[in-house]
């Protein structure tokens, strides 16, 4: 293609001039907060024994936390780009309250789970520009999530430790599996 | 201002070694993903690897083994260790910042050859 003028053919190609496409930026992201993560969860590891518990499910039964299932069409078999995409957008705004309570969660770390939330507000955004049946996406209510916040807050001491640890070992799974599936679209 | 300043590329006989670093300016380093984009004349441009802020790393499936990419935080750079180097390794490579809030940087680039 010619050369636009006051163009130097040289930059037209030049990977300086050209921002990171969609997908790129997604993948980027996915990543960004995923490293976040591993970074929260060491500390977490690292104040208790909850990454050895085998009291779980204990803590389980007052979360709700977003997974991938079969029908979300995430998996290879029976992969659905449109249906999985809703899937990961849904999820992840399902995730958003959970966020909310890791702040102040960590002492060392406050500035990292701050930033874990953050970035997937903006993955949020990517990818509801990327998402065609908008729709389809179902928003958490404000009033459920306050009331879930205000219980999570007022568990023990040991619950609240295992709910974080619960948040991150879910929220990293859910994001694994949203970059599996994305990397196919 | 943001600035990305990638050290000279050069030329290298294959099989040979070449470390790349980039020192930035203007960001906030320590928050921001680092990485190494390549392309190779008429080809697409490519991610060869980058860093995350806690270390996470992600390479090219080209690259894995022979290539390794590390950030000095308290220096402001971001370095591409490059051994064992193949022809097909020939390209431009662009060090590529990129924040939590999706604000990415490019540097200008530097011709890194392989050839006998």
């Known amino acids: 293609a010619p050369v636009p003028p006051g163009e130097d053919s040289k930059d037209v190609a030049a990977p300086h001039r050209q921002p990171l496409t969609s997908s790129e930026r997604i993948d980027k992201q996915i990543r960004y907060i995923l490293d976040g993560i591993s970074a929260l969860r060491k500390e977490t590891c690292n104040k208790s024994n909850m990454c050895e518990s085998s009291k779980e499910a204990l803590a389980e039964n007052n979360l709700n936390l977003p997974k991938m299932a079969e029908k979300d069409g995430c998996f290879q078999s029976g992969f659905n780009e449109e249906t999985c995409l809703v899937k990961i957008i849904t999820g992840l705004l399902e995730f958003e309250v959970y966020l909310e309570y890791l702040q102040n969660r960590f002492e060392s770390s406050e500035e990292q789970a701050r930033a874990v939330q953050m970035s997937t507000k903006v993955l949020i955004q990517f990818l509801q520009k990327k998402a065609k049946n908008l729709d389809a996406i179902t928003t958490p209510d404000p009033t459920t999530n306050a009331s879930l916040l205000t219980k999570l807050q007022a568990q023990n001491q040991w619950l609240q430790d295992m709910t974080t640890h619960l948040i991150l070992r879910s929220f990293k799974e859910f994001l694994q599996s949203s970059l599996r599936a994305l990397r196919q679209m | 201002q943001v600035q990305l300043v990638e050290s000279a590329g050069g030329l290298v006989q294959p099989g040979g070694s070449l470390r790349l670093s980039c020192a930035a300016s203007?960001?906030?380093?320590?928050?921001?993903?680092m990485g190494w984009y390549r392309q190779a004349p008429g080809k697409r441009r490519e991610l060869v690897a980058d860093?995350?802020?806690?270390?996470?790393?992600e390479y090219a499936d080209s690259v894995k083994g022979r290539f390794t990419i590390s950030r000095d935080n308290a220096k402001n750079t971001v370095y591409l260790q490059m051994n064992s180097l193949k022809p097909e390794d020939t390209a431009v490579y662009y060090c590529?910042?990129?924040?939590?809030?999706?604000?990415?940087?490019w540097g200008q680039g530097t011709q890194v050859t392989v050839s006998s």
């Open positions: 590529h910042s990129y924040d939590p809030r999706g604000d990415d940087y």
């Open positions: 203007g960001i906030i380093f320590s928050i921001n993903a």
């Open positions: 860093i995350m802020p806690y270390g996470s790393t």
